[in-house]
């Protein structure tokens, strides 16, 4: 069965720093979503080989990609407190497959010791909710990310 390997499980970074999230699959997919989990899951990017990636407005201009959709590294730059949350890779295949998630903890420079990652991977049932709302223009269509096929909620 198709699987999505996602790394790291967790990372703690100061405000303004960058983080890499890698999504690896065995191939045969249409594309990859990176989603920020929470009460209202938020599509951050959609990446498909040969197509201009689509990025949510809040992250526009601060996301880079390397590799291909089968082995994609997503770099999020200039992280802010409200970027704290769990990000999961969603591979678009016959059946949507999800990575285990990456918990990104963004901390103020002076409070580095307060929040630290444990070794355990994040669990979808116990994830910190991202701040309500996302980026700027009110109409959510402004982000223009393609709709994922079928239900977008986690299985």
């Amino acid at each position: 069965a198709q699987e999505v390997q996602q790394s790291p499980h967790c990372t703690t970074v100061p405000v303004g720093a960058s983080v890499n999230i890698t999504c690896s699959t065995s191939g045969g997919l249409r594309g990859i979503y990176l989603r920020q989990l929470g009460p209202q899951p938020q599509d951050i990017i959609y990446y498909e080989d040969g197509v201009v990636p689509t990025t949510d407005r809040r992250f526009r201009g601060r996301i880079d990609f390397s590799g291909s959709q089968d082995n994609l590294t997503i770099t999020m730059h200039r992280l802010q407190l409200s970027d704290t949350g769990t990000y999961t890779c969603q591979a678009i295949t016959e059946v949507n497959v999800y990575g285990s998630g990456t918990l990104v903890l963004v901390t103020e420079e002076q409070s580095q010791g307060w929040h630290r990652c444990s070794d355990a991977p994040p669990r979808a049932s116990a994830l910190p909710a991202p701040p309500t709302g996302s980026a700027l223009p009110d109409p959510q269509t402004a982000s223009a990310l393609p709709d994922p096929p079928a239900a977008s909620a986690l299985p």
Epitope: R60, Q80, P131, G133, D138
Partner: antibody
Framework: EVQLVESGGGLVKPGGSPRLSCAAY????????MSWVRQAPGKGLEWVGR??????????DYAAPVKGRFTISRDDSKNTLYLQMNSLKTEDTAVYYC???????????WGQGTLVTVSS | DIQMTQSPSTLSASVGDRVTITCRAS??????LAWYQQKPGKAPKLLIY???SLESGVPSRFSGSGSGTEFTLTISSLQPDDFATYYC?????????FGQGTKVEIK
């Protein structure tokens, strides 16, 4: 459609203390980073300062020429940004633009501007 | 502060011309650069961000390139609507600074 509407400009005497306002429409204002950028008559653009969203700490930053004299604040319940200007000098004469600053750092949206003229 | 220097200050061109404006930073700013267009009496309008990313709705005749300290805005075929002043802006740190502007006028 995103719209930013500035008000509060006009003729002010040196040393005066006007307050500019910027009403935002069509945006989730509470999540937006807001900046003021000014432009002296016939001159280029100069960043004045910013206020981050409360979810990003709500902190303010200022350009050196206005630090200690200008204060930026926001009222998320009214979708409004403010610029309190104190101890005005003639060199503060400019069109003041309210902008939405992308977290990346560029300026996504601009208001139409309001002219502040400092003269005795 | 990081200083931004644009050249030329004024550029005379005709409709259909290929136009290039250069912006130099006093220190490396990676790709943290934006370009704006401003017409008299109007607010600036974002054209390009992150050195080469075209803002939504901006015609594809506009393009940006460069990284580090040297950047270029190119208009592949100048249109009547493009006569305006163009500004670059760095945001390598959170103290943004602008170039002094390049006025593109009709030859």
């Amino acid at each position: 459609e995103v719209q930013l509407v500035e008000s509060g400009g006009g003729l002010v005497k040196p040393g005066g203390s006007p307050r500019l306002s910027c009403a935002a429409y069509g945006v989730t204002f509470s999540n937006a980073w807001m900046s003021w950028v000014r432009q002296a008559p016939g001159k280029g653009l100069e960043w004045v300062g910013r206020i981050k969203s409360k979810t990003d700490g709500g902190t303010t930053d200022y350009a050196a020429p206005v630090k200690g004299r200008f204060t930026i604040s926001r009222d998320d319940s009214k979708n409004t940004l403010y610029l309190q200007m104190n101890s005005l000098k003639t060199e503060d004469t400019a069109v003041y633009y309210c902008t939405i600053e992308a977290v990346a750092g560029h300026f996504d949206y601009w208001g139409q501007g309001t002219l502040v003229t400092v003269s005795s | 502060d990081i200083q931004m220097t644009q050249s030329p200050s004024t550029l005379s061109a005709s409709v259909g011309d290929r136009v290039t404006i250069t912006c130099r930073a006093s220190q490396s700013i990676s790709s943290w650069l934006a370009w704006y267009q401003q017409k008299p009496g109007k607010a600036p309008k974002l054209l390009i961000y992150k050195a080469s990313s075209l803002e939504s709705g901006v015609p594809s005749r506009f393009s940006g390139s460069g990284s580090g300290t040297e950047f270029t805005l190119t208009i592949s075929s100048l249109q009547p609507d493009d006569f305006a002043t163009y500004y670059c802006q760095q945001y390598n740190n959170y103290s943004p600074t602008f170039g002094q502007g390049t006025k593109v006028e009709i030859k």
